[in-house]
């Protein structure tokens, strides 16, 4: 049986300050059951970047239509990038539970921020 893959195709993305950054992530299967979340950084100090069900993330929007059936594209777009947004972003699959349990992470995409051209 094939194991779930979390695919972040770009190792790095470079964006000019003020622009939007697209961070791509797809999964190979709709199961196990459970949500996808995005984080910046790894380990216990990581920062939650996007979780559809909880929290308010005004600068982050999913790339795919949120009402799309059987979606396997969990790419996000972050608007109005600043140098403070630089870092490595991870797309993480969780297994549904109480609480949800981290199952698999993508390899990460490093976001670098260029100075806005004058």
């Amino acid at each position: 049986e094939e194991e779930l893959q979390v695919i972040q195709p770009e190792k790095s993305v470079s964006v000019a300050a003020g622009d939007s950054a697209t961070l791509n992530c797809t999964v190979s299967s709709l199961i196990p059951v459970g949500p996808i979340q995005w984080f910046r950084g790894a380990g216990p100090g990581r920062e939650l970047i996007y979780n559809l069900k909880e929290g308010h993330f005004p600068r982050v929007t999913p790339v795919s239509d949120p009402t799309k059936r059987n979606n396997m594209d969990f790419s996000i777009r972050i608007s109005n990038i600043t140098p403070a947004d630089a870092g490595t972003y991870y797309c993480v699959k969780f297994r549904k539970g109480s609480p949800d349990v981290e199952l698999k992470s993508g390899a990460g995409t490093e976001l670098s921020v260029r100075a806005k051209p004058s």
């Epitope: 299967s29 059936r69 059987n70």
Partner: antibody, heavy 120, light 108 residues
């Protein structure tokens, strides 16, 4: 076309066991969660169990008595029902889960159901 | 467990009339509501998901609306084939998935 065909229902006595099967076709069975939903005679719908890959979920009313499983090589879903009770009498529907957005499942295809009667 | 309350329990309607069915959740379920139609002796059929998205092949006379705790299924002009029982289901917080008790739509 998606097709779900349940089998294995019948009449059993309280305390006995039964195994339901659901043969699936017309979609990539192995990447979808699957569920069992039941309907007692003249009553509404009650969710019973869901399976993802090896992750399983049960209603409190059947936990410890029912076991959901799947065989992806046979495109088949199962429900092993032990220690059956009169209140388990119902039509059991096999349903294909569909996800929307980033989380959350509903049931986009249903089989015709198989009747399980538990009576002494 | 999230409880879904449907009203009315039964509705007697003439063909051509507009029908409004209600589903109220005991807590916020965002837009994670599906609606099903079940005719006697048949399996349920998905009509609406994500509160307002029509499933493939569902006639445009069926529409869903609402978010949070209050949801509505509307049949703009009832056809004779629309009789049956209509159920709402929440998938915001599970297990368990929960269904409303159903609304029976009878043809006058």
């Amino acid at each position: 076309d998606v097709q779900l065909v349940e089998s294995g229902g019948g009449v059993v006595r309280p305390g006995e066991s039964l195994r339901l099967s659901c043969a699936a076709s017309g979609f990539s069975f192995s990447i979808y969660a699957m569920s069992w939903v039941r309907q007692a005679p003249g009553e509404g719908l009650e969710w019973v169990s869901t399976i993802g890959a090896d992750d399983t979920y049960y209603a409190d009313s059947v936990k410890g008595r029912f076991t959901i499983s799947r065989d992806n090589s046979k495109n088949t879903l199962y429900l092993q029902m032990n220690s059956l009770r009169a209140e388990d009498t119902a039509v059991y529907y096999c349903a294909k889960d569909s996800t929307v957005g980033w989380s959350g499942d509903f049931f986009d295809y249903w089989g015709l159901g198989t009747l399980v009667t538990v009576s002494s | 467990e999230i409880v879904l309350t449907q009203s009315p329990a039964t509705l007697s309607v003439s063909p051509g009339e507009r029908v409004t069915l209600s589903c109220r959740a005991s807590q916020n379920v965002r837009s994670d509501i599906a609606w099903y139609q079940q005719k006697p002796g048949q399996a349920p059929r998905l009509l609406i998901y994500a509160a307002s998205s029509r499933d493939t092949g569902i006639p445009a006379r069926f529409s869903g609306s609402g978010s949070g705790t209050d949801f509505t299924l509307t049949i703009s002009s009832l056809q004779s084939e629309d009789f049956g029982v209509y159920y709402c289901q929440q998938y915001y917080d599970w297990p368990p998935f929960t269904f409303g008790g159903g609304t029976k739509v009878e043809i006058k």
